[in-house]
């Protein structure tokens, strides 16, 4: 089961003490069988297993990637998993921890001098190989932020959204990924109905900006499921 397979996301953020103020961010702590945290006059405990469901790598932390925790998968459940360190097996760049990328199925260091040539080589291999879809190249593929002193501007090549400047996200454009603007109110957005459908996008859109969500445009409710237009709308 998922519970027994996973432990990478132990204690994400702690809840507030019972009876304490809600809405205050907790602090991340490492895994333990049960964590004690102050609760009123005594200590309360929280289970250390807090799976975080996701559909895209961007929903996870920078040190995580989104995938099914078991090989067979649990009927469509994808959750954030801890990134793979150097020399660990991988299938796409997003699986490797920041400062690394996936080359020939192994996470290797994003050495500044060799990185760009190898990445281009990897893209060419992926694109020219019938067996590897664009999604094999990755959903969260952006250059490690450690490689650059400045954040990527619109149109810059990236591996992760954290490589892009504020207001931009890292999205697929043909067979590479570039920094694109986060969507504004009224702009057309993509609502992924089927798990993994984002892998088919050659021109991927960013997500909706702060305070917006991707919803069916009101005058398109009568349209057929396939032609429904989604736009970024205020909550």
């Amino acid at each position: 089961t998922l519970n027994s397979v996973l432990n990478s996301n132990a204690i994400k953020n702690l809840p507030p003490p019972l009876g304490g103020a809600a809405g205050h961010p907790g602090s991340a702590v490492s895994a333990a069988p049960g964590i004690l945290y102050p609760g009123g006059n005594k200590y309360q405990t929280i289970d250390n297993y807090q799976p975080y469901p996701c559909a895209e790598d961007e929903e996870c932390g920078t040190d995580e990637y989104c995938a099914s925790p078991t090989r067979g998968g649990d009927a469509g459940v994808q959750i954030c998993l801890a990134c793979r360190k150097r020399r660990k097996r991988c299938m796409r760049h997003a699986m490797c921890c920041p400062g690394n990328y996936c080359k020939n199925g192994i996470c290797v260091s994003s050495d500044q001098n060799h990185f760009r040539g190898e990445i281009e080589e990897t893209i060419t291999e992926s694109f020219g190989n019938d067996h590897s879809t664009l999604d094999g190249y990755s959903r969260r593929t952006t250059l490690s932020s450690k490689m650059y002193h400045t954040k990527g501007q619109e149109g810059s090549v990236c591996l992760r959204s954290s490589d892009c400047a504020s207001g931009l996200c890292c999205a697929r454009h043909f067979w590479s990924k570039i920094c694109k603007p986060v969507l504004k109110e009224g702009q057309v957005c993509t609502k992924h109905r089927r798990k993994g459908s984002h892998g088919l996008e050659i021109f991927q859109r960013c997500y909706c900006g702060e305070g917006l969500s991707c919803r069916i445009q009101k005058d398109h409710h009568q349209a057929s499921n396939s032609s429904r237009l989604h736009t970024c709308q205020r909550h």
């Epitope: 996301n9 994400k12 953020n13 809840p15 809600a22 809405g23 205050h24 961010p25 907790g26 991340a28 807090q50 975080y52 469901p53 996701c54 559909a55 895209e56 961007e58 929903e59 996870c60 932390g61 920078t62 040190d63 995580e64 469509g76 459940v77 994808q78 959750i79 954030c80 959204s161 954290s162 504020s166 207001g167 931009l168 996200c169 986060v182 609502k191 992924h192 109905r193 089927r194 798990k195 997500y207 909706c208 900006g209 702060e210 305070g211 917006l212 969500s213 991707c214």
Partner: nanobody, 125 residues
Amino acid sequence: EVQLVESGGGLVQAGGSLRLSCVVSGGTFSVYAMGWFRQAPGKLREIVAAISRTGSSIYYADSVKGRFTISRDDAKKTVYLQMNSLKSEDTAVYYCAVDGRANGERPAVAGYNYWGQGTQVTVSS
């Protein structure tokens, strides 16, 4: 001030149903994953169910699979937990939790950073 307010808890007989709601208010951030946790007296707080930002990936604890259903309404900034075929072992305080992020913000590890005060669910046999 961000607030998460749960409602829908109460006393129900075994085999009965309840629907919990949690409304997120205040703060200007995007709500990513949303989840329900529970804590029975003398036990650890445990996850019950969680739903991804787009709603396409949903996690359920083994103990509630097939009985509980989580859903979300982003327009209302609300997460729901439909609980059917309730058992006495489902008795606990139920908490909702969300991951609220400012535009473009991305933590090292994704997690639930805003929590409600909880609503009591008691299942009598």
